[in-house]
């Protein structure tokens, strides 16, 4: 059953290839365990970028090798994706699942188009 999930339509990554956006969901119940997944959609292909499960009121922890970091506050999750390059430009979808207690709820955002521009290499100085 699909919850409402909101995320910005467009975000521009900074010169270091980092993009941040907020994913906000409207919880129908009193979830204690929440799972947040970032998906990248290109044409008909969907790949998982990163995922984290957290207990409400606690910090959200991604795996050590994840390109994502994040913080949570109430029904808002602040997501940061690092190490992006121009070829990573695309639609990034926030998926939220209320894992516990039942009932299970899931919501999918409309996606954030992240634009990444590779920095110009510095000219050699003599």
């Amino acid at each position: 059953k699909a919850m409402h999930v909101a995320q910005p339509a467009v975000v521009l990554a900074n010169s270091r290839g980092t993009a941040s956006f907020v994913c906000e969901y409207a919880s129908p119940g009193k979830a204690t365990e929440v799972r947040v997944t970032v998906l990248r959609q290109a044409d008909s292909q969907v790949t998982e970028v990163c995922a984290a499960t957290y207990m409400m009121g606690n910090e959200l922890t991604f795996l050590d090798d994840s390109i994502c970091t994040g913080t949570s506050s109430g029904n808002q999750v602040n997501l940061t994706i690092q190490g992006l390059r121009a070829m990573d430009t695309g639609l990034y979808i926030c998926k939220v699942e209320l894992m516990y207690p039942p009932p299970y709820y899931m919501g999918i955002g409309n996606g954030t188009q992240i634009y990444v521009i590779d920095p110009e290499p510095c000219p050699d100085s003599d």
Epitope: A26, P28, V46, P102, P103, Y105, I108
Partner: antibody
Framework: EVKLDETGGGLVQPGRPLKLSCVAS????????MNWVRQSPEKGLEWVAQ??????????YYSDSVKGRFTISRDDSKSSVYLQMNNLRVEDMGIYYC??????WGQGTSVTVSS | DIQMTQSPASLSASVGETVTITCGAS??????LNWYQQKQGKSPQLLIY???NLADGMSSRFSGSGSGRQYSLKISSLHPDDAATYYC??????????FGGGTKLEIK
């Protein structure tokens, strides 16, 4: 123990109304979006209607086949959900299940539409 | 509306075997898929939610996988008690929350 008890099924003539009721216990009713799902040998499982809860302003949704004829409602104080079925058709026949989210299912109540 | 195509419609397998049931969506559904088990004369029971999560009280011999448009339910080391009809359901908005046509599993 989770329980969902549907009542109100029976034999009804085409074009006539029928109201189904479902009483829930054993879980937090007000946290659940409630559904009616029906089953017939011809169509298998078919989602019929959903009513969301207070945080979602009790929004309602219907399958195209029942839109305009069926009305789903709920009473959180009685942990109950209802399905008012008007202008019943032969194709509405089947077992009607009440579900809490899609996690909990009742035992079903049978609706027969025949002249 | 998104269509859900489940296959096979029926299958027969022996105790101890592993079987796989597939469910295809006509559009990407982002893992918004449940699987249900319905035994003869009983109500459906939630088996797998969110494509991969095992529902409480269900055997770990059941597992769900898939992404995008293609999903599958695997039942390992079949037991006689696994004889049932299995359904997938898309749980992504907007409605309808369509079910697949079902797969009837017979244990030889």
């Amino acid at each position: 123990e989770v329980k969902l008890d549907e009542t109100g099924g029976g034999l009804v003539q085409p074009g006539r109304p029928l109201k189904l009721s479902c009483v829930a216990s054993g879980f937090t009713f007000s946290d659940n979006w409630m559904n009616w799902v029906r089953q017939s040998p011809e169509k298998g499982l078919e989602w019929v209607a959903q009513i969301r809860n207070k945080p979602y302003n009790y929004e309602t949704y219907y399958s195209d086949s029942v839109k305009g004829r069926f009305t789903i409602s709920r009473d959180d104080s009685k942990s109950s959900v209802y399905l008012q079925m008007n202008n019943l058709r032969v194709e509405d026949m089947g077992i009607y299940y009440c579900t809490g989210g899609m996690d909990y299912w009742g035992q079903g109540t049978s609706v027969t539409v025949s002249s | 509306d998104i269509q859900m195509t489940q296959s096979p419609a029926s299958l027969s397998a022996s105790v101890g075997e592993t079987v796989t049931i597939t469910c295809g969506a006509s559009e990407i559904i982002y893992g918004a898929l449940n699987w249900y088990q319905q035994k003869q004369g009983k109500s459906p029971q939630l088996l797998i939610y969110g494509a991969t999560n095992l529902a409480d009280g269900m055997s770990s011999r059941f597992s769900g996988s898939g992404s995008g448009r293609q999903y599958s339910l695997k039942i390992s080391s079949l037991h006689p008690d696994d004889a049932a009809t299995y359904y997938c359901q898309k749980i992504l908005s907007p409605p309808p929350w369509t079910f697949g046509g079902g797969t009837k599993l017979e244990i030889k």
